[in-house]
């Protein structure tokens, strides 16, 4: 059946994707999470840059900073303390690593109008936070943290030993921010405030990478990072707390770690406080499959914290690692002992167990061949959750409500059929007591931000829709996309495959394959996104295909932790199998494949260009890890143990990049990476290509001088075209 | 094989202070709590306190608060404990223990007699 | 403090007979307790660990049960080496409490 006249029309007036509507992010979308403040109000920055207070019961909103007063110190970012007496306005902001900065803090008094004048605060500022209660300001700067009991005050120094590069207070050393507790920060206020705990960490015996950051000057300067490679020895953590109201009357009281813990090398993962006197700790062994949850209660007559057997929870994997990616953390009830948390069942899938005195006698509180990913609040009636149960969609996230104060306890999905074609991909945030809550909707269909009310879960208004996005893209011929499985070997490989807009089964296209495939990631979800590889299905005809092999996430155990000690072997295997099936379909020309990846991606495309399986033509990788060993002790040793002879080194070194230099003869292989990749070194592309050289085996590179693991600014724009480039001349495409 | 080897005897004077030393190999020092326990004639066992070697962190019981400091020499795997301020009731044997999570005390020095007598 | 309570604080008894011993705590202490033996002159020597484990080179005659506040030591037939002082440990806490002992002697 044809369309009528007036819709090819249209279609002719409808134009494909160009590189440059990427590079310029003409179809970015935005979402909307509110600032909550109270149970019924939420701070939300205006598009003209005011600060708006907005109530959602009385419906009222009004400006409680200007815009006027952000621009006077420039401020990029504010944060209203809990008495709404001040505000601090950041500026300056400098960014460090993947979440860190410092920035230049100022304090603006709400009740007068002006900016506190007196013992302002020092720059720049690694860290500051208001109390949970009240307006103490708990700051770090150069390591050592310091606590005001009111702003205008004089500050408190906390802790001494501070140095740079050796040890930290309050916040994280390289590998603890990228690897462990993914924040900039390691300290955390009681919730009202009584009591501050944080973390030392002592990096004094750890080897640093040293790169140059060749600048401007007539000399590069180095920089040196203490960066724990796999085996390496490890940074040495405290943890500390301090009474914030008698800072000076007992000093900082050390929280001792677990004897069965102590024994060998550790980690500290996260810290949750429970009570103002209560505090839940949480360990994890150097071999990443014993966790203790530790919960510590302050002792008056003692002055300190005492963290009793009987409150220590083990949490052990016998088929893998502890956890996911990272050790969930407890989401505790309100008799302040019982908690709920994420871990697997005895089938192997991640689930929500409730914990009230031991890990043995955990109730099960959801089941079945999916996974719980997410606990966002629990209150004295309800626990809200994240899932991919609906529909067997691992890729979908939906949120639920599991009643608790019934039983049995009564389960309902808030999102399910909310807009059904549209959202398929939710996170949430919640008020005070979930009185109200947002909805983000990431795709299939272009985002919106909603806002619900807690109790009845009715939606009271829409926060944001994208609408501009949504008329910029009517006359946008966009990819069609699909999401599908392949059962392969008792193995399901679910796929998103992304189509030119005239697709035709009957014709033969380029297949470039898009991969990560990292342990416990996934690529396959149902996400709206305009981006590079859109454009290539658009304007430049390419199928795509995204395909979660084993040790992705959210399936269950058996995938997630087939690559336990094996990096590099299964997850180049599946995209090989999948490429095969497409192959299959019948529409994939097999002289023209092709496969990128970014980090973990790069390390799995160039593994597969060098399978010597003769699938792929061409392939790209971005700033790849090339050897285990090259990799930071947190990451790699979880999924790999260490590479000592009566370990797991023999993997180390059969699972390099460097070992198959040979097998990229008769492939076409660009090969990139910044100078000044903090994360994944330089070292590991430096490493693959002096061992093609030396193999001399033929092969395309790009530096990107003083640029670190994300290419940004004007490199993104350079990469992007010079990927393109190189991809449209492997597939003998016109430019 | 585990073994704790402590200081010899000690005679002091009220008012003084002694340090007594605890020797520890056959295993990781720096990955076990090192308790130390009195006892004086007569009488039953009194827990002190303890010192985590690899941190050097300390917990004391109250009735040695203020009186007692326990270090470590990770170096020569060897733990101390100082009580200071001595009167004749803390003359006793003291002995240093190693923690072993499931076990609690399971290795000893062969204890040290502190006498304080003018 | 958790409070060790041991009763009774001298059991007379011959050799063959049954010995029992009880530990009361002051509040719940889980399975964190240990028992040892001390004989006049000698360090004291670890004989039952976690309530109930038995360690290893301790005759099995030896054998401790309970959790939570009550615990028992029982040794099923007295034996001539058996006459000396027991002493219960909590461990559950950091801040460890002994009993203050019983002395098994020969009737």
């Known amino acids: 059946l044809r369309p009528p006249r007036v819709h090819n029309s249209e279609e002719n007036t409808m134009r494909a994707l160009t590189l440059k509507d990427i590079l310029n992010g003409t179809f970015s979308y935005k979402t909307f999470f509110p600032n909550w403040i109270s149970g019924q109000e939420y701070l939300h920055q205006s598009a003209d840059n005011n600060i708006v207070l907005y109530n959602i019961e009385t419906g009222q909103s009004y400006t409680i900073l200007s815009n006027r007063t952000m621009k006077s110190v420039n401020a990029s970012n504010y944060g209203l303390s809990p008495d709404r007496q001040f505000v601090y306005l950041e500026s300056d902001y400098s960014k460090l690593w993947r979440y860190s900065y410092t920035a230049t803090y100022y304090i603006y008094d709400l009740s007068n109008g002006e900016f506190v004048r007196g013992n302002e605060l020092p720059r720049p500022i690694q860290y500051l936070c208001w109390s949970p209660v009240g307006s103490k300001l708990a700051y770090v700067y150069q390591n050592n943290i310091y606590l005001k009991q009111r702003p205008g005050d004089p500050p408190f120094q906390i802790t001494f030993n501070g140095r740079e590069n050796k040890i930290f207070n309050g916040i994280p050393d390289w590998v603890y921010e990228e690897e462990m507790l993914a924040t900039k920060y390691a300290l955390w206020w009681s919730p009202n405030g009584k009591f501050l705990a944080y973390a030392e960490f002592n990096d004094t015996d750890i080897p640093v990478i040293a790169y140059s950051y060749y600048g401007d000057e007539q000399y590069p300067r180095t920089i040196n990072i203490p960066y724990p490679k796999a085996g390496a020895k490890n940074p040495f953590v405290r943890i500390f707390i301090i009474d914030t109201t008698y800072p000076a009357y007992v000093g900082p009281q050390e929280v001792p770690v677990p004897a069965m813990i102590a024994s060998s090398d550790y980690y500290f993962s996260w810290l949750t406080w429970v009570t103002d006197e209560r505090v839940c700790l949480q360990w994890l062994k150097r071999v990443q499959n014993v966790s203790v949850l530790s919960i510590c209660d302050f002792r008056e007559d003692w002055q300190t914290w005492d963290c009793p057997k009987t409150q220590e929870h083990i949490e052990e994997s016998r088929t893998g690692w502890a956890g996911g990616f990272f050790v969930s953390t407890p989401v505790f009830s309100y008799d302040a002992i019982s908690y709920y948390k994420i871990f697997s069942d005895k089938d192997g899938y991640k689930h929500i167990h409730y914990i009230k005195d031991t890990v043995e006698n955990a109730i099960q509180i959801t089941s079945g061949k999916w996974e719980a990913i997410n606990i966002f609040r629990v209150t004295q009636d309800s626990l809200f959750y994240s899932s991919n149960e609906f529909e067997d969609y691992p890729g979908r996230r939906n949120i639920y409500r599991i009643s608790i104060g019934s039983y049995p306890p009564s389960k309902k999905c808030v999102t399910c059929h909310l807009r059904k074609e549209r959202c398929q991909y939710y996170t949430a945030s919640f008020s005070d007591y979930a009185k109200y809550y947002a909805l983000v909707c990431y795709g299939p269909g272009i985002p919106i931000s909603t806002l619900h009310d807690g109790r009845t879960d009715q939606e009271i208004k829409i926060l944001e829709e994208n609408k501009e996005l949504e008329n910029a893209l009517k006359n946008i011929q966009l990819p069609k996309e699909e999401i599908k499985k392949l059962e392969v070997d008792e193995i399901t490989l679910w796929y998103k495959m992304i189509l030119p807009p005239q697709f035709d089964r009957s014709k033969k296209y380029p297949l470039l394959i898009q991969v990560y495939g990292g342990p416990c990631s996934q690529s396959v979800r149902s996400v709206f996104a305009v981006n590079w590889i859109s454009y290539l299905a658009s304007k430049e005809g390419m199928v795509i295909a995204l395909v979660d092999g084993r040790g992705t996430a959210f399936q269950g155990d058996k995938l997630l932790y087939a690559v336990y000690r094996k990096l590099g072997v299964y997850e180049v295997e599946d995209q090989i199998t999948a490429v095969r099936k497409f192959i299959e379909m019948g529409f994939i020309d097999e002289k023209r494949i092709a496969i990128w990846g970014w980090s973990y991606g790069g390390y799995v495309s160039s593994l597969a260009l060098a399978s010597g399986t003769g699938l792929f033509k061409c392939g790209i990788a971005v700033a790849p890890v090339s050897s285990w060993e090259y990799y930071a002790s947190v990451y790699t040793e979880r999924f790999m143990g260490l590479p000592t002879k009566d370990d797991n080194l023999e993997h180390y070194k059969n699972s390099t990049v460097m070992a198959r230099a040979e097998y990229f003869r008769n492939v076409d292989y660009l090969l990139i990476h910044g100078t000044a990749d903090d994360n994944v070194h330089f070292q590991n592309s430096a490493q693959i290509a002096k061992a093609l050289v030396n193999a001399q085996v033929d092969f395309q590179a790009m530096w990107y001088s003083d640029q670190n693991h994300g290419l940004s600014g004007l490199s993104t724009n350079h990469l992007y075209t010079h990927m393109t480039h190189f991809l449209k001349q492997c597939f003998s495409l016109s430019d | 094989q585990v073994q704790l080897v402590q200081s010899g005897a000690e005679v002091k004077k009220p008012g003084a202070s002694v340090k007594v030393s605890c020797k520890a190999s056959g295993y990781t020092f720096t990955g076990y709590y090192m308790h130390w326990v009195r006892q004086a004639p007569g009488q039953g066992l009194e827990w002190m306190g303890w010192?985590?070697?690899?941190?050097?962190?300390?917990n004391y019981a109250q009735n040695f608060q203020g009186r007692v400091t326990m270090t470590r020499d990770t170096s020569i795997s060897t733990a101390y404990m100082e009580l200071s301020s001595l009167r004749s009731d803390d003359t006793a044997v003291y002995y240093c223990?190693?923690?072993?999570?499931?076990?609690?005390?399971?290795?000893w020095g062969q204890g040290t007699l502190v006498t304080v007598s003018s | 403090d958790i409070q060790m309570t041991q009763s009774p604080s001298t059991l007379s008894a011959s050799v063959g007979d049954r010995g029992t011993i009880t530990c009361r705590a002051s509040?719940?202490?889980?399975?964190?307790l240990a028992w040892y033996q001390q004989k006049p002159g000698k360090t004291p020597k670890l004989l039952i660990y976690k309530a109930s484990s038995l360690e290893s080179g301790v005759p099995s005659r030896f054998s401790g049960s309970g959790s939570g506040t009550e615990f028992t030591l029982t040794i099923s037939s007295l034996q001539p080496d058996d006459f000396a002082t027991y002493y219960c440990q909590q461990y559950n806490s950091y801040f460890r409490t002994f009993g203050q002992g019983t002395k098994v002697e020969i009737k």
């Open positions: 223990a190693r923690d072993d999570y499931n076990k609690n005390l399971d290795y």
């Open positions: 509040q719940s202490i889980g399975s964190w």
């Open positions: 010192i985590y070697p690899n941190t050097g962190g300390t």
